[in-house]
């Protein structure tokens, strides 16, 4: 899960609903910084690279992150 930060917050709206991992191009966890005081989780979808912001406090999103991390660790040697 790549970490990055633009020079401002990105998310206009946030979703409590997890996205289908199969539809995911990438998932970014962007830590709070001097530029944006909140953690942002941005799911980039395969369709046209659309981005959906996910609520870091949502239980469903936390479960999604666990699932994605698990999948990644399975794939790494």
């Amino acid at each position: 899960v790549p970490l990055s930060r633009t020079v401002r917050c990105t998310c206009i709206s946030i979703s409590n609903q997890p996205v289908n991992p199969r539809s995911l191009e990438k998932l970014e966890i962007i830590p709070a910084s001097q530029f944006c005081p909140r953690v942002e989780i941005i799911a980039t979808m395969k369709k046209k690279g659309e981005k959906r912001c996910l609520n870091p406090e949502s239980k469903a999103i936390k479960n999604l992150l666990k699932a994605v991390s698990k999948e990644r660790s399975k794939r790494s040697p």
Epitope: R8, C9, T10, C11, I12, S13, I14, S15, N16, C36, P37, R38, I42, T44, K47, K48, G49, E50, K51, R52, C53, N55
Partner: antibody, heavy 121, light 108 residues
């Protein structure tokens, strides 16, 4: 169901101020960005401003930047537009609109019925 | 800033197909959304992300987007489709929402 109800419109003299409100219900207000869009009589739609779900991001159209301020009170499920230094060309129906929820391309999935603002001496 | 160009009007006979274009520089790289507005009413989202339809919008409404032109197609046009139609994009380079000038669809 989603409901957006604007209020605060009226007739005001050039140079004066007005504050519009939009009462929201039927969805988790604190999770969604909100917009103001206006439409001058007989003209097309013009986007005015957007505010993020927590109020940390605000973007404005060039035509209102420095004069209008968008804000929100998530505890009251209410969106505001403070309009200062009003001009005759600000005369329009002002709609509040809910953002669809994708950050990559802002979209309006629900609209209020609008409130009329007339700036005239 | 980014500009979207629509024809001011389109006329179509009932039962025929209406095509409304929305031109913009490399618009195919952006997501285009379409709204229908009837007189005295608020706009209604009819197509989002180029070609997706919100629930409750008839299948007669479809969209496409490539190159410098996005198109809203209304098949088997009905009298109730008479309205103004607006295309819209988010211009991330300027952080502005941009609307086209609108197209008045008249059903003959």
């Amino acid at each position: 169901q989603v409901q957006l109800v604007e209020s605060g419109g009226g007739v005001v003299q050039p140079g004066r101020s007005l504050r519009l409100s939009c009462a929201a219900s039927g969805f988790t207000f604190s999770s969604y960005g909100m917009h103001w869009v206006r439409q001058a009589p007989g003209k097309g739609l013009e986007w005015v401003a957007v505010i993020s779900y927590d109020g940390s991001i605000k973007y404005y159209a060039d035509s209102v930047k420095g004069r209008f301020t968008i804000s929100r009170d998530n505890s009251r499920n209410t969106l505001y537009l403070q309009m200062n230094s009003l001009r005759p060309e600000d005369t329009a129906v002002y709609y509040c609109a809910k953002d669809w929820g994708f950050s990559g391309s802002l979209t309006f999935d629900y609209w209020g019925q609008g409130t009329m603002v007339t700036v005239s001496s | 800033s980014y500009v979207l160009t629509q024809p001011p009007s389109v006329s179509v006979a009932p039962g025929k197909t209406a095509r409304i274009t929305c031109g913009g520089n490399n618009i195919g790289s952006k997501s285009v959304h379409w709204y229908q507005q009837k007189p005295g009413q608020a706009p209604v989202l009819v197509i989002y992300y180029d070609s997706d339809r919100p629930s409750g919008i008839p299948e007669r409404f479809s969209g496409s987007n490539s190159g410098n032109t996005a198109t809203l197609t209304i098949s088997r046009v009905e009298a109730g489709d008479e309205a103004d139609y607006y295309c819209q994009v988010w211009d991330s380079s300027s952080d502005h929402v941009v609307f086209g000038g609108g197209t008045k669809v008249t059903v003959l």
